[in-house]
């Protein structure tokens, strides 16, 4: 099971002092959101027990494997369900803590109930403040059962759940009708997926016989040990005030584990620490009792004394849970409760035993999960013990499980089961990822998903030029950091592969799939300079440049011209794809715009240094429109147009253009040039009699300007059909242009 503990501090006089801490003993736990260890999550779960909204709770991370939740402002903030999630991948595990209000109408006699599939579970809610009304039981927030208040037995409302199945698991509550949900008794029911003493997919495997209140996990057969106990079968007690799968964690504060509730992965649930009991875990065990919630009885024999944390402390000459075994009986010594080896390794396993008569090599044997018995290849005999060494044949996955060391002498026999985990070395499922490249180096992310088992102890990156038969170069890197491969050849493809290792002999996995990474071209180093430029129109610019003369071939594929329009915040890029080019025509520019211009050499995707910039002002486009255009019929074939010059001219007008069109006509308009720009009047001749015409005009400097307003006028009647309009200009009357 995952080594994950959720601690609740139950000193409830002041909710602001209340805290929840989630502690992980897993390697690499909580390091962050990378492939090597997702973070610990600790949160209040409001899906079932909803409480009034309050200020947000504060989450504090203490190192890599601990997270604490604080900031409770009132007792109601505490009521409900809290969860901690830890572990990576398939081992991701949620630990749940259910908090009851000490002032609730109904209180649970026992919060966590772990039962086997098919058992009858009985939830008991004790009356704390009586109400003469119905009691409603809910399961995961939905209605489940109703009791009349008369149905209380000895001040308790009982909910019997016969033949429970795993889907019956969840949060149960008992509430008086019309009472606040915060006054409910909340329970957690955990239903193991198998009957008592069994585990595995078909519940065909036998549990190891967990001691001291440990619970056999229905998926992997491991004992989830109560806080304060360790070992494959929870056979060893931790020192007072310690917890965790290896007793590696210490209870905070001077009073040890007093006032703390410990929640462990299912199917264990929650309990007080070893040596403590009561709804707030503040009461020491009564004499003769020990362990989590003081649920265990010592029953020590042969002069043993009861320690409320560890159980029987045996006098010299005796051992066993109740001091019932004489030291004359052989005894397995200091056997590790769990060993880990890598697949296909051939490890040596030692098993030490003592006793009277003294065990010899042939009296110690090792039994594998499939029943195969191994005999020791050698034994080391010391005054106080014999250590037998077993050479294990090449390990396969089926060797995972409970092994047993057994000693037999004429004085009796002893055996010790221990768990062997056969781990599969990790193999990358994907190639490493290229982050950035330069001409002589590649920056690579080695973090890839993998098959097999973690944790990852080392990452090796193997690389060599593509299609090469030379030896691979290898670099050993930190799993969590990006790697820079240096001193490479420019514009060269490299085959790159990852190899992952896990701890222990034979932990190196196979190489992952290769990927091709290509170094960049050499960077172009020459800096061009702008020789000159000239405007070829309002939107056209001819640019020329030069390069310094250097020996050898030119490193470059072409030039990049950049025009920066600072007013509009726009950049225009023009690619000149010949490295021999020294001039370029830029078209489609915006007239009247102030540009900053530079040029740089490029090679592949790399840009060389830019030339010093030049500042270019394009002339504006055509002039503004003529003003106050007016048409006046003179005869049946002539109309006079008058106007005023445009304002704010950027230069001298070269000509005017008049557009003539028959009103409502479908044909193209006729354009007539007025080549004397000083004129402010012209006569359009050759028009048809009694015909309505539309006129507009514009000026030209270097380009044509904006059109004026359109005016309408009709020729006078009864004339002959004309050949077509022509114009005659004349100077305006004095002062007309003012």
């Amino acid at each position: 099971a995952v080594d994950l503990t959720l601690l609740a501090n139950l000193r409830l006089t002041d909710p602001q002092r209340f805290f929840l801490t989630c502690v992980s003993g897993e390697a690499g736990a909580g390091r962050g959101s990378d492939a090597w260890g997702p973070p610990l999550l600790l949160e209040k779960d409001d899906r079932i027990v909803r409480t009034p909204p309050g200020p947000p709770l504060r989450l504090a991370r203490n190192g890599s494997h601990q997270v604490t939740l604080r900031g409770f402002s009132k007792p109601s903030d505490l009521v409900g369900v809290f969860s901690c999630v830890g572990g990576a991948g398939a081992r991701r595990t949620r630990v749940i803590y259910v908090h009851n209000s000490p002032g609730a109408h109904l209180l649970p006699d026992k919060v966590t109930h772990t039962v086997n599939k098919g058992d009858t579970a009985v939830l008991s809610a004790r009356v704390h403040k009586e109400k003469q009304t119905d009691v409603i039981w809910k399961s995961n927030g939905s209605y489940f059962y109703t009791l009349d208040w008369h149905e209380a037995q000895d001040g308790r409302f009982l909910l019997q759940l016969p033949n429970v199945q795993p889907p019956s698991s969840g949060i149960y509550s008992a509430t008086y009708l019309e009472a606040s949900p915060l006054g409910s008794a909340f329970f957690r029911l955990i239903v193991r997926g198998c009957g008592a003493g069994r585990w595995g997919p078909g519940c065909t495997k036998e549990c190891p016989g967990c001691l001291h209140g440990g619970v056999c996990h229905d998926h992997d057969g491991e004992c989830v040990c109560p806080p304060g106990f360790t070992g494959t079968r929870c056979e060893q007690a931790c020192r007072e005030g310690r917890f965790g799968q290896s007793c590696q964690e210490q209870c905070p504060g001077i009073s040890g584990c007093r006032g703390l509730t410990f929640c462990l992965p299912d199917p264990y649930g929650c309990s007080c620490g070893s040596g403590w009991r009561g709804s707030q875990c503040q009461e020491a065990c009564a004499p003769g009792h020990f362990g989590a919630d003081c649920r265990l009885q010592c029953q020590c024999q042969n002069g043993g004394t009861c320690d409320r944390f560890s159980g029987c402390v045996c006098p010299s000459g005796w051992h066993g849970v109740h001091c019932e075994k004489s030291d004359r009986i052989p005894q397995i010594l200091n056997m590790a409760s769990e060993l880990e080896f890598n697949l296909e390794t051939m490890p040596r396993i030692n098993c030490a035993a003592a006793g009277n008569p003294f065990p010899v090599r042939g009296s110690i044997e090792l039994r594998k999960p499939d029943g195969t018995v191994l005999l020791s290849t050698k034994a080391i005999v010391e005054p106080e013990k014999t250590t037998a060494e077993f050479e294990v044949p090449r390990l396969v996955l089926a060797d995972s499980g409970f092994w047993e060391c057994r000693v037999s002498t004429s004085g009796g026999q002893d055996s010790r089961r221990f768990k062997v985990n056969v781990k599969v070395p990790p193999v990358p499922l994907a190639a490493p990822r290229l982050l950035t490249k330069q001409s002589r180096q590649l920056v690579v992310s080695p973090l890839v998903s993998f098959s097999g088992d973690g944790p990852i102890s080392t990452v090796r990156l193997h690389y060599r030029p593509q299609d090469s038969t030379m030896d691979w170069s290898t670099i050993v890197v930190d799993p969590s950091e990006n790697v820079t491969l240096m001193n490479l050849r420019p514009k060269t493809g490299y085959s790159v592969r990852v190899q992952l290792s896990r701890p222990g002999e034979g932990g190196e996995g196979a190489w992952g799939p290769p990927t091709l990474m290509t170094t960049d071209c050499p960077e172009p180093l020459l800096q061009p300079w702008l020789e000159g430029w000239h405007v070829e129109g309002t939107d056209r610019l001819r640019v020329s440049w030069s390069l310094p003369l250097v020996p050898g071939p030119l490193v470059g594929d072409g030039f990049l011209l950049r025009l920066w329009d600072g007013t509009r915040g726009q950049e225009r890029r023009e690619n000149v794809s010949s490295p021999q080019a020294r001039t370029a025509l830029l078209t489609g520019l915006t007239p009247g715009t102030h540009y900053q211009l530079d040029v740089q050499l490029y090679h592949c995707t790399l840009l060389g240094p830019a030339s010093p910039p030049a500042h270019v002002l394009l002339p504006p486009s055509g002039p503004p429109a003529p003003r106050h255009l007016h048409a006046q019929a003179l005869s049946d074939s002539e109309i006079q147009l008058t106007w005023k010059h445009p304002e704010a001219l950027p230069g001298p007008i070269s000509k005017y253009v008049v557009e003539v069109q028959v009103a409502g006509g479908a044909g193209d308009p006729l354009w007539i040039d007025v080549d004397r720009p000083e004129e402010t009047s012209t006569i359009i001749r050759g028009l048809n009699a009694s015909t309505r015409y539309l006129f507009r005009m514009r000026a030209s400097i270097q380009g044509l300007g904006d059109w004026s307003n359109t005016v309408e006028e009709s020729t006078l009647g009864n004339g002959l059909q004309a050949e077509g309009p022509v114009q005659e200009s004349r100077a305006a009357e004095e002062g007309l242009d003012q």
Epitope: Q132, D134, Y143, Y145, T146, L147, D148, E151, L177, E178
Partner: antibody, heavy 117, light 110 residues
Framework: EVQLLESGGGLVQPGGSLRLSCAAS????????MTWVRQAPGKGLEWVSR????????YYADSVKGRFTISRDNSKNTLYLQMNSLRAEDTAVYYC??????????WGQGTLVTVSS | QSELTQPASVSGSPGQSITISCTGT??????????VSWYQQHPGKAPKLLIY???DRPSGVSNRFSGSKSGNTASLTISGLLAEDEADYYC????????SRSYVFGTETK
């Protein structure tokens, strides 16, 4: 799908007896309080009796107390109403209904009881 | 047993909203509990639960039906009236005392 089906109604003389049944399906019958409600022709609804899931506690309207008995058989998913000493004013459509906390969330289609000489 | 008082009839046009009131006589029913429910009954049919716990709607009931409570009076509001809303409506309240349990219905509102 929750279903409640009443049966046992009919014509009975004043002073006579009748036993109504209500067959339940589609839910865990043994977890819910059950209720009988009646409706006299052209009149409103009148609560008659309630029984708790265990069957151990029962309550009655004053108008039927001492004459009617509510019971249940959780193994058969069936609710009963034993009606004795029937009177003309007991003439009504009798509905069984499932109690959920403090509401009646599912009702049967009803069975007509007519008390007449 | 005293009943809960409702108006004998309420009318409205399609698309309009109407409100039916339900007034209790003691703190044992509407005023004292948040356990008022509303039922709809079409002629010749069984009653159907529309609202429970004053304002909660069972799944499958249109959100045009809503409930509320103020003091000793509960209310059912039907918005966007449809022809199919024409029916009898009853309020109900679960009444609990130390010695009895009962269920009280209001006088019908057409």
């Amino acid at each position: 799908e929750v279903q409640l089906l009443e049966s046992g109604g009919g014509l009975v003389q004043p002073g006579g007896s009748l036993r109504l049944s209500c067959a339940a399906s589609g839910f865990t019958f043994s977890n819910y309080p059950m209720t009988w409600v009646r409706q006299a022709p052209g009149k409103g609804l009148e609560w008659v009796s309630r029984i708790y899931p265990s069957g151990g506690y029962t309550y009655y309207a004053d108008s039927v107390k001492g004459r009617f008995t509510i019971s249940r058989d959780n193994s058969k998913n069936t609710l009963y109403l034993q009606m004795n000493s029937l009177r003309a004013e007991d003439t009504a459509v009798y509905y069984c209904a499932r109690g959920r906390i403090a509401a009646l969330d599912y009702w049967g289609q009803g069975t007509l009881v007519t008390v007449s000489s | 047993q005293s009943e809960l008082t409702q108006p004998a009839s309420v009318s409205g046009s399609p698309g309009q909203s109407i409100t039916i009131s339900c007034t209790g006589t003691s703190s044992d029913d509407v005023g004292g509990y948040n356990y008022v429910s509303w039922y709809q009954q079409h002629p010749g049919k069984a009653p159907k639960l529309l609202i429970y716990d004053v304002s909660d709607r069972p799944s499958g009931v249109s959100n045009r039906f809503s409930g509320s409570k103020s003091g000793n009076t509960a209310s059912l509001t039907i918005s966007g009236l449809l022809a199919e809303d024409e029916a009898d409506y009853y309020c109900g309240s679960y009444r609990v005392t130390s010695v009895s349990r009962s269920y009280v219905f209001g006088t019908e509102t057409k």
